[in-house]
Protein backbone atom coordinates (compact mmCIF):
# COMPACT_ATOMS: atom_id res chain seq x y z
CA UNK A 1 0.00 0.00 0.00
CA UNK A 2 1.36 3.74 -0.33
CA UNK A 3 2.80 5.24 2.35
CA UNK A 4 1.84 8.45 3.17
CA UNK A 5 3.85 11.01 4.86
CA UNK A 6 3.26 14.55 7.04
CA UNK A 7 -0.35 13.54 6.92
CA UNK A 8 -1.26 14.62 10.53
CA UNK A 9 -3.51 17.38 12.21
CA UNK A 10 -2.43 18.30 15.93
CA UNK A 11 -5.70 16.97 18.19
CA UNK A 12 -5.71 20.78 19.29
CA UNK A 13 -7.36 21.89 16.45
CA UNK A 14 -10.20 19.57 17.10
CA UNK A 15 -10.69 20.63 20.59
CA UNK A 16 -12.18 24.45 19.85
CA UNK A 17 -15.78 24.39 20.66
CA UNK A 18 -16.52 27.79 19.69
CA UNK A 19 -15.18 26.84 15.99
CA UNK A 20 -16.80 23.13 16.11
CA UNK A 21 -20.11 24.82 16.63
CA UNK A 22 -19.50 27.72 14.07
CA UNK A 23 -18.77 24.90 11.20
CA UNK A 24 -21.95 22.60 12.46
CA UNK A 25 -24.06 25.58 12.43
CA UNK A 26 -22.65 26.51 9.01
CA UNK A 27 -23.37 23.36 7.62
CA UNK A 28 -26.68 23.32 9.25
CA UNK A 29 -28.13 26.61 7.41
CA UNK A 30 -26.76 25.45 3.98
CA UNK A 31 -28.36 21.78 4.77
CA UNK A 32 -31.48 23.54 5.21
CA UNK A 33 -31.44 25.06 1.66
CA UNK A 34 -30.23 21.59 -0.17
CA UNK A 35 -33.37 19.90 -1.03
CA UNK A 36 -31.58 17.18 -2.45
CA UNK A 37 -30.89 14.74 0.23
CA UNK A 38 -30.56 11.47 -2.12
CA UNK A 39 -26.90 12.56 -2.98
CA UNK A 40 -24.27 12.00 -0.41
CA UNK A 41 -20.62 13.62 -1.21
CA UNK A 42 -18.71 12.53 1.41
CA UNK A 43 -19.72 8.56 2.38
CA UNK A 44 -19.28 4.93 1.37
CA UNK A 45 -18.56 5.40 -2.19
CA UNK A 46 -15.60 8.28 -1.28
CA UNK A 47 -14.27 6.20 1.03
CA UNK A 48 -14.68 2.63 -0.78
CA UNK A 49 -11.10 0.96 -1.51
CA UNK A 50 -9.18 3.76 0.14
CA UNK A 51 -7.21 2.10 3.72
CA UNK A 52 -7.55 4.12 6.86
CA UNK A 53 -3.35 4.96 6.82
CA UNK A 54 -4.80 6.72 3.16
CA UNK A 55 -8.07 8.48 4.63
CA UNK A 56 -6.29 11.94 5.50
CA UNK A 57 -4.15 12.45 2.09
CA UNK A 58 -8.22 11.78 0.31
CA UNK A 59 -9.60 13.94 3.06
CA UNK A 60 -7.41 16.72 1.87
CA UNK A 61 -8.22 16.55 -1.36
CA UNK A 62 -11.40 16.89 -0.36
CA UNK A 63 -11.19 20.20 2.00
CA UNK A 64 -9.04 21.87 -0.90
CA UNK A 65 -11.27 21.10 -3.50
CA UNK A 66 -13.94 22.73 -0.97
CA UNK A 67 -12.26 25.80 0.02
CA UNK A 68 -11.15 26.52 -3.77
CA UNK A 69 -13.87 25.66 -5.70
CA UNK A 70 -17.09 25.73 -3.46
CA UNK A 71 -16.30 27.85 -0.09
CA UNK A 72 -14.33 31.41 -1.76
CA UNK A 73 -16.57 31.53 -4.54
CA UNK A 74 -19.71 31.37 -2.14
CA UNK A 75 -18.05 33.12 0.67
CA UNK A 76 -20.87 36.10 0.55
CA UNK A 77 -23.51 33.78 1.74
CA UNK A 78 -24.11 32.13 5.07
CA UNK A 79 -22.89 34.46 7.46
CA UNK A 80 -21.68 35.37 9.55
CA UNK A 81 -20.47 31.59 10.04
CA UNK A 82 -19.04 31.36 6.67
CA UNK A 83 -16.27 34.03 7.51
CA UNK A 84 -14.84 32.37 10.69
CA UNK A 85 -15.64 28.79 9.25
CA UNK A 86 -13.51 29.53 6.14
CA UNK A 87 -9.96 31.13 7.55
CA UNK A 88 -10.13 27.61 9.90
CA UNK A 89 -10.65 25.12 7.13
CA UNK A 90 -7.80 26.94 5.60
CA UNK A 91 -5.46 27.42 8.33
CA UNK A 92 -6.06 23.13 8.37
CA UNK A 93 -5.41 22.64 4.55
CA UNK A 94 -2.21 24.94 4.96
CA UNK A 95 -1.29 22.65 7.53
CA UNK A 96 -2.02 19.34 5.65
CA UNK A 97 0.41 21.25 2.91
CA UNK A 98 3.31 18.75 3.00
CA UNK A 99 0.91 15.47 3.30
CA UNK A 100 1.40 13.20 0.15
CA UNK A 101 1.72 9.71 -0.89
CA UNK A 102 4.29 7.90 -2.20
CA UNK A 103 2.94 5.27 -4.48
CA UNK A 104 0.17 5.38 -6.70
CA UNK A 105 -2.74 7.33 -5.54
CA UNK A 106 -4.87 6.32 -8.74
CA UNK A 107 -7.66 5.22 -6.33
CA UNK A 108 -7.90 8.23 -4.07
CA UNK A 109 -7.65 10.72 -7.71
CA UNK A 110 -10.55 8.32 -8.87
CA UNK A 111 -12.93 8.71 -5.97
CA UNK A 112 -12.14 12.24 -5.57
CA UNK A 113 -13.19 13.15 -8.71
CA UNK A 114 -16.08 11.35 -8.35
CA UNK A 115 -17.23 13.72 -6.09
CA UNK A 116 -15.94 16.75 -7.89
CA UNK A 117 -17.93 15.44 -10.80
CA UNK A 118 -21.34 15.47 -9.02
CA UNK A 119 -20.92 18.54 -7.15
CA UNK A 120 -19.97 20.21 -11.16
CA UNK A 121 -23.22 18.36 -12.15
CA UNK A 122 -25.58 19.86 -10.11
CA UNK A 123 -23.90 23.29 -10.14
CA UNK A 124 -25.03 25.90 -7.50
CA UNK A 125 -26.90 23.19 -5.29
CA UNK A 126 -23.63 20.91 -5.49
CA UNK A 127 -22.11 23.47 -3.78
CA UNK A 128 -24.66 24.13 -1.29
CA UNK A 129 -24.97 20.10 -0.83
CA UNK A 130 -20.72 20.55 0.06
CA UNK A 131 -20.87 23.40 2.19
CA UNK A 132 -23.81 21.54 3.77
CA UNK A 133 -21.31 18.21 4.55
CA UNK A 134 -18.58 20.25 5.98
CA UNK A 135 -19.72 19.04 9.45
CA UNK A 136 -19.25 15.44 7.42
CA UNK A 137 -15.53 16.86 6.28
CA UNK A 138 -14.66 17.95 9.99
CA UNK A 139 -15.59 14.93 10.96
CA UNK A 140 -13.97 12.72 8.58
CA UNK A 141 -10.54 14.69 8.69
CA UNK A 142 -10.88 14.57 12.74
CA UNK A 143 -10.81 10.82 12.48
CA UNK A 144 -8.48 10.16 9.98
CA UNK A 145 -5.83 12.89 10.61
CA UNK A 146 -5.04 12.56 14.41
CA UNK B 1 -18.94 -12.41 8.77
CA UNK B 2 -18.75 -10.15 11.34
CA UNK B 3 -18.47 -11.15 14.80
CA UNK B 4 -18.20 -9.25 18.08
CA UNK B 5 -17.71 -10.60 21.34
CA UNK B 6 -17.89 -9.03 24.98
CA UNK B 7 -16.72 -10.34 27.98
CA UNK B 8 -15.36 -8.96 31.68
CA UNK B 9 -19.11 -7.96 32.85
CA UNK B 10 -19.86 -8.85 36.02
CA UNK B 11 -20.94 -7.78 39.56
CA UNK B 12 -19.60 -5.18 41.40
CA UNK B 13 -19.83 -2.61 44.86
CA UNK B 14 -20.42 0.98 44.33
CA UNK B 15 -17.02 2.58 43.24
CA UNK B 16 -15.56 -0.17 42.23
CA UNK B 17 -13.70 -1.16 38.26
CA UNK B 18 -14.24 -3.52 35.83
CA UNK B 19 -12.72 -3.77 32.14
CA UNK B 20 -14.97 -4.81 29.09
CA UNK B 21 -13.50 -6.46 26.15
CA UNK B 22 -14.69 -6.87 23.03
CA UNK B 23 -13.03 -9.56 20.93
CA UNK B 24 -13.24 -8.65 16.87
CA UNK B 25 -13.24 -10.74 13.79
CA UNK B 26 -14.75 -11.01 10.82
CA UNK B 27 -13.11 -7.69 9.14
CA UNK B 28 -10.43 -5.52 8.99
CA UNK B 29 -10.17 -4.02 12.65
CA UNK B 30 -8.30 -1.07 12.49
CA UNK B 31 -10.08 0.17 9.18
CA UNK B 32 -13.04 1.30 11.74
CA UNK B 33 -14.24 3.39 14.58
CA UNK B 34 -15.12 1.52 17.29
CA UNK B 35 -18.04 2.45 20.11
CA UNK B 36 -19.64 0.88 23.46
CA UNK B 37 -23.24 1.45 23.53
CA UNK B 38 -25.24 0.66 26.69
CA UNK B 39 -29.01 -0.07 28.04
CA UNK B 40 -30.08 -0.43 31.37
CA UNK B 41 -32.56 -2.96 31.85
CA UNK B 42 -35.68 -1.76 30.31
CA UNK B 43 -34.43 1.14 29.02
CA UNK B 44 -33.23 2.75 26.52
CA UNK B 45 -29.96 3.16 24.45
CA UNK B 46 -27.29 5.17 25.60
CA UNK B 47 -23.81 5.76 23.97
CA UNK B 48 -20.60 5.26 25.97
CA UNK B 49 -17.87 6.11 24.04
CA UNK B 50 -16.04 5.90 20.99
CA UNK B 51 -12.99 5.76 19.52
CA UNK B 52 -11.38 6.30 15.96
CA UNK B 53 -9.73 3.72 14.01
CA UNK B 54 -5.92 4.23 15.09
CA UNK B 55 -7.05 5.19 18.82
CA UNK B 56 -5.88 8.98 18.25
CA UNK B 57 -9.38 10.35 19.39
CA UNK B 58 -11.45 8.78 22.07
CA UNK B 59 -14.69 10.64 22.87
CA UNK B 60 -16.92 9.87 26.20
CA UNK B 61 -20.49 10.64 26.86
CA UNK B 62 -20.94 13.09 29.71
CA UNK B 63 -22.06 10.45 32.03
CA UNK B 64 -19.06 8.46 32.25
CA UNK B 65 -16.18 11.26 31.20
CA UNK B 66 -13.24 10.61 34.00
CA UNK B 67 -14.22 7.66 35.14
CA UNK B 68 -14.25 5.19 31.76
CA UNK B 69 -11.08 4.89 29.64
CA UNK B 70 -11.87 3.52 26.05
CA UNK B 71 -9.02 1.90 24.20
CA UNK B 72 -7.84 -0.34 21.58
CA UNK B 73 -5.53 -2.91 20.42
CA UNK B 74 -5.26 -3.23 16.89
CA UNK B 75 -2.96 -6.29 16.50
CA UNK B 76 -5.19 -8.30 18.80
CA UNK B 77 -8.04 -7.18 16.90
CA UNK B 78 -9.49 -5.85 20.51
CA UNK B 79 -11.68 -3.01 22.12
CA UNK B 80 -11.72 -2.32 25.86
CA UNK B 81 -13.85 -0.16 28.06
CA UNK B 82 -11.59 0.15 31.72
CA UNK B 83 -14.50 1.87 34.15
CA UNK B 84 -13.79 3.28 37.29
CA UNK B 85 -15.62 4.56 40.13
CA UNK B 86 -18.84 2.43 39.19
CA UNK B 87 -21.96 3.46 40.33
CA UNK B 88 -25.57 1.89 40.74
CA UNK B 89 -26.65 3.54 37.23
CA UNK B 90 -23.82 2.54 35.28
CA UNK B 91 -25.93 -0.70 36.02
CA UNK B 92 -26.91 -2.29 31.68
CA UNK B 93 -25.61 -4.38 29.05
CA UNK B 94 -22.69 -3.24 27.39
CA UNK B 95 -22.29 -3.56 23.93
CA UNK B 96 -19.66 -3.24 21.71
CA UNK B 97 -20.43 -1.87 18.21
CA UNK B 98 -18.88 -1.10 14.99
CA UNK B 99 -19.16 1.38 12.45
CA UNK B 100 -21.02 0.67 9.57
CA UNK B 101 -18.92 1.43 6.86
CA UNK B 102 -14.98 2.29 7.39
CA UNK B 103 -15.37 6.11 8.10
CA UNK B 104 -18.96 6.22 9.47
CA UNK B 105 -18.04 5.64 12.92
CA UNK B 106 -20.96 7.23 14.17
CA UNK B 107 -23.22 4.70 12.32
CA UNK B 108 -23.38 1.46 14.27
CA UNK B 109 -23.87 -1.06 11.52
CA UNK B 110 -22.43 -4.20 13.75
CA UNK B 111 -23.39 -5.21 17.39
CA UNK B 112 -22.17 -7.66 19.77
CA UNK B 113 -24.65 -10.05 21.81
CA UNK B 114 -23.24 -7.15 24.99
CA UNK B 115 -21.76 -7.94 28.65
CA UNK B 116 -24.00 -7.08 31.66
CA UNK B 117 -22.57 -4.96 34.17
CA UNK B 118 -24.11 -4.82 37.82
CA UNK B 119 -23.49 -1.78 40.45
CA UNK B 120 -24.49 -2.89 43.45
CA UNK B 121 -23.83 -3.16 47.46
CA UNK C 1 -32.69 12.21 29.88
CA UNK C 2 -32.99 11.52 25.79
CA UNK C 3 -31.50 14.90 23.89
CA UNK C 4 -33.15 13.93 20.90
CA UNK C 5 -37.28 13.35 21.80
CA UNK C 6 -39.61 10.58 19.99
CA UNK C 7 -43.25 9.62 20.84
CA UNK C 8 -42.80 6.83 24.00
CA UNK C 9 -45.44 4.89 21.46
CA UNK C 10 -47.26 4.05 18.17
CA UNK C 11 -49.86 1.63 16.13
CA UNK C 12 -50.94 1.04 12.95
CA UNK C 13 -52.95 -2.09 11.63
CA UNK C 14 -51.09 -4.74 8.85
CA UNK C 15 -50.69 -2.88 6.01
CA UNK C 16 -50.53 1.01 7.34
CA UNK C 17 -48.03 3.09 7.53
CA UNK C 18 -46.68 4.74 10.57
CA UNK C 19 -44.35 7.82 10.82
CA UNK C 20 -41.96 8.29 14.31
CA UNK C 21 -40.48 11.30 14.81
CA UNK C 22 -37.42 12.91 15.88
CA UNK C 23 -37.05 16.31 17.31
CA UNK C 24 -33.49 17.83 18.60
CA UNK C 25 -33.93 19.41 22.08
CA UNK C 26 -32.36 22.11 20.78
CA UNK C 27 -31.18 23.13 17.22
CA UNK C 28 -27.54 22.66 17.61
CA UNK C 29 -27.71 19.21 16.45
CA UNK C 30 -26.46 20.48 13.24
CA UNK C 31 -28.49 19.71 10.58
CA UNK C 32 -29.03 16.28 11.22
CA UNK C 33 -25.98 15.10 8.89
CA UNK C 34 -25.84 12.09 10.59
CA UNK C 35 -29.13 10.93 11.67
CA UNK C 36 -29.55 6.90 12.04
CA UNK C 37 -32.53 5.15 12.73
CA UNK C 38 -32.09 1.41 14.47
CA UNK C 39 -34.94 -1.89 15.36
CA UNK C 40 -34.68 -3.66 18.40
CA UNK C 41 -36.91 -6.54 19.00
CA UNK C 42 -36.90 -7.89 23.13
CA UNK C 43 -34.41 -9.92 24.03
CA UNK C 44 -32.25 -9.11 20.74
CA UNK C 45 -29.36 -6.29 19.78
CA UNK C 46 -30.00 -3.67 18.11
CA UNK C 47 -30.19 -3.32 13.93
CA UNK C 48 -29.19 -0.63 11.98
CA UNK C 49 -32.56 0.28 9.53
CA UNK C 50 -31.32 3.65 8.04
CA UNK C 51 -27.89 5.83 7.93
CA UNK C 52 -27.23 9.22 6.38
CA UNK C 53 -30.79 10.64 6.57
CA UNK C 54 -32.06 8.12 4.40
CA UNK C 55 -29.99 5.35 3.09
CA UNK C 56 -30.63 1.92 3.79
CA UNK C 57 -28.15 -0.73 4.64
CA UNK C 58 -28.62 -3.93 2.40
CA UNK C 59 -31.32 -6.09 3.70
CA UNK C 60 -33.36 -3.68 5.05
CA UNK C 61 -36.54 -4.13 3.45
CA UNK C 62 -37.65 -0.81 1.05
CA UNK C 63 -40.43 -0.54 3.57
CA UNK C 64 -38.39 1.58 5.70
CA UNK C 65 -37.85 4.82 4.60
CA UNK C 66 -36.16 7.88 6.26
CA UNK C 67 -36.30 11.95 5.71
CA UNK C 68 -35.67 14.93 7.46
CA UNK C 69 -37.38 18.41 7.77
CA UNK C 70 -35.65 21.09 9.71
CA UNK C 71 -34.73 20.07 12.82
CA UNK C 72 -37.27 17.02 12.52
CA UNK C 73 -35.94 13.46 11.30
CA UNK C 74 -38.51 10.89 10.57
CA UNK C 75 -39.14 7.10 9.55
CA UNK C 76 -41.70 5.65 7.84
CA UNK C 77 -42.49 2.08 7.52
CA UNK C 78 -45.06 1.24 5.11
CA UNK C 79 -47.30 -2.04 4.61
CA UNK C 80 -46.75 -2.77 8.29
CA UNK C 81 -46.06 -6.31 9.29
CA UNK C 82 -46.46 -8.43 12.39
CA UNK C 83 -42.42 -8.81 12.24
CA UNK C 84 -42.37 -4.67 12.51
CA UNK C 85 -43.08 -4.83 16.04
CA UNK C 86 -40.03 -3.80 18.30
CA UNK C 87 -38.74 -0.46 19.17
CA UNK C 88 -37.28 2.26 17.55
CA UNK C 89 -34.67 4.28 18.34
CA UNK C 90 -33.20 7.30 16.24
CA UNK C 91 -29.76 8.99 16.83
CA UNK C 92 -27.05 11.69 15.53
CA UNK C 93 -23.67 12.20 15.87
CA UNK C 94 -23.21 16.19 17.69
CA UNK C 95 -20.93 19.21 17.38
CA UNK C 96 -20.05 18.02 20.84
CA UNK C 97 -18.33 14.58 19.15
CA UNK C 98 -20.77 12.43 20.88
CA UNK C 99 -23.71 10.00 19.61
CA UNK C 100 -27.04 10.99 21.26
CA UNK C 101 -30.23 8.36 21.10
CA UNK C 102 -33.96 9.20 21.29
CA UNK C 103 -35.74 7.86 24.29
CA UNK C 104 -36.92 4.76 21.85
CA UNK C 105 -40.60 4.51 20.10
CA UNK C 106 -42.46 0.75 20.60
CA UNK C 107 -44.61 0.36 17.42
CA UNK C 108 -47.21 -1.80 18.39
CA UNK C 109 -49.17 -4.05 15.22
CA UNK C 110 -52.43 -4.02 15.96
Known amino acids: APISSHCRLDKSNFQQPYITNRTFMLAKEASLADNNTDVRLIGEKLFHGVSMSERCYLMKQVLNFTLEEVLFPQSDRFQPYMQEVVPFLARLSNRLSTCHIEGDDLHIQRNVQKLKDTVKKLGESGEIKAIGELDLLFMSLRNACI | EVQLVESGGGVVRPGGSLRLSCAASGFTFDDYGMNWVRQAPGKGLEWVSG????????DYAASVKGRFTISRDNAKNSLYLQMNSLRAEDTALYHCARGWYSGSFYYFGYWGRGTLVTVSS | QAALTQPASVSGSPGQSITISCTGASGDVGAYNFVSWYQQHPGKAPKLIIY???KRPSGVSNRFSGSKSGNTASLTISGLQAEDEADYYC??????????FGGGTKLTVL
Open chain 3, 91 to 100: SSYTSTFSVV
Open chain 3, 52 to 54: DVN
Open chain 2, 51 to 58: VNWNGGTR
